[in-house]
Interface confidence: low
């Protein structure tokens, strides 16, 4: 669509007459019609298969026609099509003589024509004024012409039509060509899709309108490139969504069965060697002189009694000090410097002369032990403490310190290793001779029904449009992720682009 | 006030012969271009030939170049077409019209119409 423009500039009739040579009275009031067809090599009658138009008076004999409009005609005239301009045209020019103000052929006379002219040739589509001149005998006619394409047309041709916008349509302004050009922040053949926020990424994000970056279910971070793990996921991470892949020293479905007590709690003191010994449970292996499951107790080197014939005991920083009693030396007081007749044996022990007096011996009663019958039978030079406890003296009395899994006087009794409910997901626990058994529900297995097993929610490619299926471990289900263009918990729906568009 | 008024139209075997007459009358008869279109039902209205005022062109359409003639009359003001060879296809309402230009056919102006029928 277009428009032939025809700009009237100089109509020259200097003598005042008609193309029979008869003059006008008292002057040729002129005005013009015009007529545009398609090209013939010989203009001949025939349709104005392009259009025609025609002007009131502009003027009388010889006159200048002025840019603007002129007594309500329009210069210049306006000659509108709405076809492909084929670059070619045939035009005819009349000027015709109007005795008075009617200008209908009725009212004029039968000779009122003043002259004719006809032009074919070529022309393209442009701003540029074509500037041309006609004369006759008796007139001579300066005009100039040009087509242009009419509003939102474009082309060689004003054959490609091109209307701005910036709605859900599309977002774009037209080129000289007719070609669109996008907006900032738009994309596509129409414009219509958002380019998204630099560096958003191209699966797992999308975007509604330009410098956005939505995340897709499982994704979250500014770009969307970070999956988000299973939810519950304590010391765990994922590379794909609903993942908990557990970091070091962590077990479970969600991370968070500690398998390195002794890294993350340190609970062996005094420079005690943690050793791991299974889920939250460890053993300490003390330096000398501490004791305790967490080697938290100093022992004092004097609870083994290591001085003999009555001597005392000191506790030092490094060790021990035997104080001797009258008649012994040595670092336990176990050299002698008495004979039976300084009667040496105490609570009621016997006194046996030796080496010709020289030395002696005490025969003790029971509960009493030493070189003069002066200790007490230790209570656990018998290991009394079973399933490896540790006995302690204590005073008159003794007690066994038991090992994580037992209990009682003598640490007699095994703890039911099903006490703490070690079986996860309602598995049922069974005590063994050596340990325990989880007995898992349908769903679990593991050695404590720990790993999920149940029925893959994406086995039955719920997800359409090659969306990527998650397993939701937590609920059995799926999630879907969607390729761009498509919505819905399926990805089932199209974007909603209407079939056709407006232009 | 310009008046057209046809004449002539009626019903005519496949080969057959009609001549159709134009009255003008309210105008100056010579100085403009007068010509004959014709509109079949359902169909766009189809230009057939018209004649000039100056030097008497004659311009016909491809589809009836050959068997149709117009003239004119100046003297009576009347326009003819004289249709030969005529085929159903010719079957129309055939309108006379005025341009206001000299040279060129343009629908200006027209009458009521004649119904032309070529039937066996």
């Known amino acids: 669509s277009g428009v032939f423009q025809l700009q009237l500039q100089e109509f020259i009739n200097e003598r005042g007459v008609l193309a029979s040579g008869r003059p006008c009275e008292p002057g040729c009031r002129t005005f013009f019609r015009v007529c545009l067809k398609h090209f013939q090599a010989v203009v001949s009658p025939g349709p104005c298969t392009f259009g025609t138009v025609s002007t009131p008076v502009l003027g009388t004999n010889s006159f200048a026609v002025r840019d603007d409009s002129s007594g309500g005609g329009r210069n210049p005239l306006q000659l509108p099509f709405n076809f492909t301009w084929p670059g070619t045209f045939s035009l005819i020019i009349e000027a015709w003589h109007a005795p008075g103000d009617d200008l209908r052929p009725e009212a004029l006379p039968p000779d009122a024509l003043i002259s004719k002219i006809a032009i074919q040739g070529s022309l393209a589509v442009g701003q540029n004024w074509l500037l041309d001149e006609q004369t006759s005998t008796l007139t001579r006619l300066r005009y100039s012409y040009r087509v242009i394409c009419s509003d939102n047309y474009y082309g060689d041709n004003c054959s490609r039509l091109c209307k701005k916008r910036n709605d859900h349509f599309g977002h774009y302004v037209c080129q000289p060509d007719g070609n669109l050009s996008c907006l900032p922040g738009w994309t596509g053949e129409y414009c219509q899709q958002p380019i998204c926020l630099s560096g958003c990424h191209e699966q797992n994000g999308y975007c509604s309108k330009p410098a956005e970056c939505l995340c897709r279910p499982g994704w979250q971070g500014r770009l969307c490139n970070e999956c988000i793990p299973h939810n519950g996921c304590r010391h765990g991470t994922c590379s794909t969504p609903w993942q908990c892949t557990c970091d070091e020293g962590w077990g479970g479905l969600f991370c968070d069965q500690d398998l390195n007590y002794c890294t993350h709690h340190s609970p062996c003191k005094n420079g005690a060697t943690c050793s791991n010994s299974g889920q939250r449970s460890y053993t300490c292996t003390c330096r000398p002189g501490y004791t305790g499951v967490d080697c938290e107790l100093e022992l004092s080197e004097c609870d083994s009694n290591p001085c003999r014939n009555g001597g005392s005991c000191k506790d030092q920083e490094d060790g021990y000090h035997c104080l001797c009693p009258p008649g012994y030396y040595g670092l336990h007081c176990e050299h002698s410097t008495l004979s039976c007749a300084d009667s040496p044996c105490f609570n009621g022990g016997s006194c046996r002369e030796r080496n010709q007096g020289a030395n002696y011996a005490c025969e003790c009663p029971p509960n009493f032990t030493g070189s003069n019958c002066e200790k007490k039978v230790d209570r656990c030079t018998s290991n009394p403490c079973a399933n490896g406890g540790q006995c302690l003296n204590r005073g008159p009395s003794r007690m066994c310190r038991c090992r994580p899994g037992f209990t009682g006087t003598y640490c007699e009794l095994h703890v039911s290793d099903c006490a703490r409910n070690p079986c996860a997901h309602g598995g049922t626990c069974h005590d063994l001779e050596n340990g325990l058994m989880c007995t898992c529900p349908a769903g679990f297995s593991g050695r404590r029904c720990e790993v999920r097993t149940s029925i893959d929610a994406c086995a039955s490619s719920p997800c359409f449009n090659r969306a990527t299926c998650y397993t939701d471990l937590s609920t059995d289900t799926f999630v879907c992720n969607c390729p761009y263009g498509f919505v819905g918990s399926r990805c089932e729906f199209p974007v909603g682009l209407p079939p056709s568009f407006p232009w | 006030e310009v008046q057209l008024v046809e004449s002539g139209g009626g019903l005519v075997q496949p080969g057959g012969s009609l001549r159709l007459s134009c009255a003008a009358s309210?105008?100056?008869?010579?100085?403009?271009?007068l010509g004959w279109f014709r509109q079949a039902p359902g169909k766009e209205r189809e230009w057939v030939s018209c004649?000039?005022?100056?030097?008497?062109?004659?311009y016909y359409a491809d589809s009836v170049r050959g068997r149709f003639t117009i003239s004119r009359d100046n003297a009576k003001n009347t326009v003819y077409l004289q249709m030969n060879r005529l085929k159903p296809e010719d079957t129309a309402i055939y309108y006379c019209?005025?341009?206001?230009?000299?040279?060129?056919?343009?629908?200006?102006?027209w009458g009521q119409g004649t119904q032309v029928t070529v039937s066996s």
């Open positions: 309210g105008f100056t008869f010579e100085n403009y271009a």
């Open positions: 019209a005025l341009s206001l230009g000299s040279s060129w056919c343009a629908y200006d102006y």
């Open positions: 004649i000039s005022s100056s030097d008497g062109t004659t």
